[in-house]
């Protein structure tokens, strides 16, 4: 649970964060797991600890191994493990699978490729970007902050993208590279402010006490592949996971693409064995993307069971 894989290339900088998170004021001690030897904090060392971060400046193949971080509050010590592997630089252009970060996909209007792990480093723009080892040139490619934007994406843009940047530590510069695959969804698309199709704003949903009830949060975000689009439910302004009511769970519905090409998402809120107190809660359907957040609120009301016999009298 509190173990994390990290990897890097020899002679490059590698910075690893302790997988056991604590409050910012807590101290963190790092150790070589095999020897239990403490890792120094003095920056003159090639490998040194700096709070939640373990820094290899630069990394060597021999640094590979498991590192223990102990996060210390005034009264508690909690342990995490970083499994670090440093590889020799490849002589050819191919980047092996074990050096690849997670694949991202894009479409014509959404083509951001984020540089993996860059937030751990002290770097300055611009980033250098390479595709299949070739430096990217031309007006279609824009290095913006920590990501690459490709204008007018085509299927031929799929491939392995490497970002290269310089980490600065006390005036010394160290190179860092990270590679991930980019796939292209071949569709014309655009992104817009979320439109919630269901539920209606301030909708009252009738439910029967003791029965199960489903609420569907459905929203559309534009056409084509959408980046950072999500729908979710909140109860009284609290995330479902934090609310701690096992009878109430949210379940991701299917990604939908309607005949008009709109890309929509569903999230179903399932309430088992509806109770009286569920009627007092505020149910918020939230839809969010890069443009912003839209919220529709639903309340539950008691539905009186129908006497079916009377209908046919």
């Amino acid at each position: 649970k509190f173990s994390k894989q990290s990897w890097g290339l020899e002679n490059e900088a590698l910075i690893v964060r302790c997988p056991r998170q604590g409050k910012p004021s807590y101290t963190v001690d790092w150790y070589y797991s095999q020897t239990n030897k403490s890792i120094p904090t003095q920056e003159r060392n090639r490998v040194f600890a700096s709070g939640q971060l373990l820094k290899f400046l630069p990394a060597a193949v021999a640094d590979s191994g498991i590192y223990t971080c102990i996060v210390r509050s005034p009264t508690f010590n909690r342990t995490g493990y970083a499994n670090v592997t440093i590889y020799k630089k490849q002589s050819d252009c191919n980047v092996p699978d074990y050096l690849m970060y997670s694949t991202v996909s894009g479409s014509e209007k959404n083509s951001k490729i984020y540089c993996p792990t860059i937030d751990l480093y002290n770097w300055t723009a611009p980033l250098e970007w390479f595709k299949n080892c070739q430096a990217l040139q031309g007006s279609r490619y824009r290095a913006h902050k920590s990501f690459l934007v490709i204008d007018n994406v085509m299927t031929e843009d799929a491939g392995d993208y490497t970002c290269k940047f310089i980490h600065n530590e006390n005036g010394a510069n160290y190179s860092v590279t990270a590679t991930r695959s980019f796939t292209v969804k071949d569709e014309q698309g655009f992104s817009l402010f979320p439109v919630i199709g269901a539920p209606a704003q301030n909708e009252i949903k009738e439910v029967e006490i003791g029965k199960n009830a489903n609420l569907t949060c459905s929203a559309c975000f534009g056409k084509g592949t959408q980046f950072l689009a999500a729908v979710l439910w909140q109860l009284n302004g609290t995330k479902i996971t934090d609310f701690g009511e096992p009878r109430i769970q949210q379940e991701e519905g299917q990604n939908q693409s309607f005949s008009n090409g709109l890309a929509c998402l569903d999230m179903v809120l399932r309430i088992a064995d509806v109770k009286e107190e569920d009627l007092l809660l505020q149910y918020d359907c939230l839809a969010l993307n890069l443009h912003g957040l839209r919220r529709h609120t639903v309340r539950l009301s008691r539905k009186n069971p129908i006497d079916h016999h009377s209908i046919y009298c």
């Epitope: 604590g22 508690f76 996971t241 934090d242 096992p246």
Partner: antibody, heavy 123, light 107 residues
Framework: EVQLLESGGGLVQPGGSLRLSCAAS????????MIWVRQAPGKGLEWVST????????SYADSVKGRFTISRDNSKNTLYLQMNSLRAEDTAVYYC????????????????WGQGTLVTVSS | EIVLTQSPATLSLSPGERATLSCRAS??????LAWYQQKPGQAPRLLIY???NRATGIPARFSGSGSGTDFTLTISSLEPEDFAVYYC?????????FGQGTKVEIK
């Protein structure tokens, strides 16, 4: 020295209301998640509610949801539990306690507890 | 909701003896488990966190072990002040849940 001091307990009739307070001292109250736990006479411990330190998100046990409201006033270093529609089964000693660690979306142990305040619901 | 089942309900032992208390979870809680001691008329006191780490000021005779669903609290040699009720608690997910308790009484 960390201290938690509950107050506000007492005898109340079924359907009535009470507001419990927990005065905290000896630590930076605003950054810690705070919890109410109760213990019925001769019974075990039951988590009642949690309020986050940063953001103030709340969660409740099934048995009190919709009737109890947890809140905090960081300027007064005080935790509250508003209890409405009280039932006989809510009779218990109510403890406030501190979660000394939790980060967003996680929970931890309870390292400091108050001495408890007794709530009796009876007609 | 994760259910924690403690056994035995009561443990009758003499001072100096070894006490072994069990806590079983209905599903895995990794190492997110704590043990508390409670004496009559007092609030619970944290003994063990993260399944095996002793809280500050807790004597070395208390130790915790286990991971996943099966956990043990061991008191290597009972002192007179150790006779009390012991609770386990999981904190991997809400709602936080406690075991029903094990009473360690003087034989």
């Amino acid at each position: 020295e960390v201290q938690l001091l509950e107050s506000g307990g007492g005898l109340v009739q079924p359907g009535g209301s009470l507001r419990l307070s927990c005065a905290a001292s000896g630590f930076t109250f605003s950054i810690y998640d705070m919890i109410w736990v109760r213990q019925a006479p001769g019974k075990g411990l039951e988590w009642v509610s949690t309020i986050r330190g940063e953001g103030g998100g709340t969660s409740y046990a099934d048995s009190v949801k919709g009737r109890f409201t947890i809140s905090r006033d960081n300027s007064k270093n005080t935790l509250y539990l508003q209890m409405n529609s009280l039932r006989a089964e809510d009779t218990a000693v109510y403890y406030c306690a501190r979660d000394p660690w939790s980060t967003e979306g996680s929970f931890f142990v309870l390292d400091y507890w108050g001495q408890g305040t007794l709530v009796t619901v009876s007609s | 909701e994760i259910v924690l089942t403690q056994s035995p309900a009561t443990l009758s032992l003499s001072p100096g003896e070894r006490a072994t208390l069990s806590c079983r979870a209905s599903q895995s809680v990794d190492d997110d488990l704590a043990w508390y001691q409670q004496k009559p008329g007092q609030a619970p006191r944290l003994l063990i966190y993260d399944a095996s780490n002793r809280a500050t000021g807790i004597p070395a005779r208390f130790s915790g072990s286990g991971s996943g669903t099966d956990f043990t609290l061991t008191i290597s040699s009972l002192e007179p002040e150790d006779f009390a009720v012991y609770y386990c608690q999981q904190y991997i997910t809400a709602p936080l849940t406690f075991g029903q308790g094990t009473k360690v009484e003087i034989k």
